[in-house]
Every structure is written in structure tokens, then in C-alpha cells.
């Protein structure tokens, strides 16, 4: 996926160095891995490991590669056509509502509830009431009320930082 594009994401303007490949735009657009020149005549390749573009575009600059935060692991590096993929470390997760940081998974469920879902890089453990089977959406329970569980194993990316 491409990263959302705002002013701070655009790589600083650099004149095309000799090693940067050029090609001609197609219908005014440049292919993934390139951006368009200021005069619109050339497609200039992004710089591997520094910036990227994922779609056909008329961007004046490629997008700056994301760096994974502490508390994240890099699943795949930035290429000219794909941003870095970062994932929360084991035992932590990132919610869609709070994508800024990885949060620690709960260690267990409240009394009277059972765990039906493990901690993953994109979700906390899931607890349901023993009798009704309804999900628990409360805060982290007090320690004496918990049934402990081990963190789940990492799977696919929780957040494509690009």
C-alpha cells in the first residue's frame, strides 16, 4: 500500500543524478518506482531504500521511506515501489483507532470470561463471557481477576506503514 501523502512525507527535491534512470511519461503519468520531472517530460526513478512510489503518478517527488519505530520490527524493507512494512513486536498490538503506537496486550481475561483470541500484532486478546459468549470490551482487568495467557505468535502485518 502507499503511504498517505502529506508535505512532510515528500523527499527533499534533488536534481536527477546520473544514476537515476529516466523514461518518458505515459499519458502524463509515471509508473510505480518513479516520479515526474518538473517540466513533465521525464519519469525519474526513485532512490532504492530512500524513497518510493507505489502507483502510476504525476508526483513531483517520490515519497520518503518510513522508518520503523522502536517497538516495531521491519517485515520488509523499503523498495522503489513499496514502503517499509513495520509490525508491532510480539506481545504488543496496534489498533486502527490508535495507529500511532503499539500497545501491550492484556495478559489475561477477567474472572468469568474465557480467552477465545490470542494477542496478535493488530489485536489484543479476545475475551468472552463463559455463559453468554458475548465479547468483553472493558479495560485491562485487575491482576487478581485475570486468567493468564501467553502472547500469540506474530502473523501478517498489523500496519502497513506505507
Amino acid at each position: 500500500e502507499s503511504a498517505l501523502i502529506t508535505q512532510q512525507d515528500l523527499a527533499p527535491q534533488q536534481r536527477a543524478a546520473p544514476q537515476q534512470k529516466r523514461s518518458s511519461p505515459s499519458e502524463g503519468l509515471c509508473p510505480p518506482g518513479h516520479h515526474i520531472s518538473e517540466d513533465g517530460r521525464d519519469c525519474i526513478s526513485c532512490k532504492y531504500g530512500q524513497d518510493y512510489s507505489t502507483h502510476w503518478n504525476d508526483l513531483l517527488f517520490c515519497l520518503r521511506c518510513t522508518r520503523c519505530d522502536s517497538g516495531e520490527v521491519e517485515l520488509s524493507p523499503c523498495t522503489t515501489t513499496r514502503n517499509t512494512v513495520c509490525q508491532c513486536e510480539e506481545g504488543t498490538f496496534r489498533e486502527e483507532d490508535s495507529p500511532e503506537m503499539c500497545r501491550k496486550c492484556r495478559t489475561g481475561c477477567p474472572r468469568g470470561m474465557v480467552k477465545v483470541g490470542d494477542c496478535t500484532p493488530w489485536s489484543d486478546i479476545e475475551c468472552v463471557h463463559k455463559e453468554s459468549g458475548t465479547k468483553h470490551s472493558g479495560e485491562v482487568p485487575a491482576v487478581e481477576e485475570t486468567v493468564t495467557s501467553s502472547p500469540g505468535t506474530p502473523a501478517s502485518p498489523c500496519s502497513l506503514s506505507g
Epitope: 500500500e1 498517505l4 502529506t6 512532510q8 504525476d58 495507529p99 506505507g162
Partner: nanobody, 125 residues
Framework: QVQLQESGGGLVQAGGSLRLSCAAS????????MGWFRQAPGKEREFLAA????????YYADSVKGRFTASRDDAKSTAYLQMSRLRPEDTGIYYC??????????????????WGQGTQVTVSS
């Protein structure tokens, strides 16, 4: 909070053109990314185009490359999608989106923080 309102949809014959507008209110969106998705009947929402701040350029899906042009006027807090050479398969509800953080993927529906109500585009053959 950002409110988005699309307009400009309608019925058009294959080969024709339409221009969609998306007016944002609630706060300045000059440093936000804006984009366009569509949902065809019975299908998932599909990324079409993403417009960067200050007319710095746009991203396009392969399916609309060369036919659709995204633009924006930050002074008016409005984004536009100029659609030409329309095809029957372009029929669907067109949504304007805004995403607020640099880490959010704008080319996936999950990455959009704010959605408009959508405007219907029907392309007849």
C-alpha cells in the same frame, strides 16, 4: 472532525465525462491527503486516486490511469475528480476520503479517516 460532501454524479453515456467535487468542512485539510474510492454493485470499495497537498501530484489506480484526473483547491477545501472516457464498468458510488496521518495507507479503504456520503455515477452503454 471533517465533513465531506460529494457532488457531480449522475447518468452519463459510455465515452462521456463527469466532474465530481468533494467539499470539506470542519477544519482545514491543506496538509491532509484526499482521495477517491468507488464501490460498484456487489464489489468491495476500490481505490481510484489520491491527491496530495498543494497540487504536489496524484496517485492513480491502473483501472483509471489516463482517464481520470484528480486535483484539489486547498483554498476552497475542495477536491475534484475529472472523469473522461467513461465505461459501463465505472458505474458505482463514488466516495471522497481524507486521511489525517502520514502513516495511514490512503490506497486502502482502512486508511481513510473520514468518508463522504458518496455520489452515484451510472454509465450506460
Amino acid at each position: 472532525q471533517v465533513q465531506l460532501q460529494e457532488s457531480g454524479g449522475g447518468l452519463v453515456q459510455a465515452g462521456g465525462s463527469l466532474r465530481l467535487s468533494c467539499a470539506a468542512s470542519g477544519r482545514s485539510i491543506s496538509n491532509y491527503a484526499m482521495g477517491w474510492f468507488r464501490q460498484a454493485p456487489g464489489k468491495e470499495r476500490e481505490f481510484l486516486a489520491a491527491s496530495v497537498w498543494n497540487n504536489g501530484g496524484n496517485y492513480y489506480a491502473d483501472s483509471v490511469k489516463g482517464r481520470f484526473t484528480a486535483s484539489r483547491d486547498d483554498a476552497k477545501s475542495t477536491a475534484y475528480l475529472q472523469m473522461s472516457r467513461l465505461r459501463p464498468e465505472d458505474t458505482g458510488i463514488y466516495y471522497c476520503v481524507v486521511a489525517r496521518t502520514p502513516e495511514t495507507p490512503i490506497t486502502s479503504a482502512r486508511g481513510a479517516n473520514y468518508w463522504g456520503q458518496g455520489t452515484q455515477v451510472t454509465v450506460s452503454s
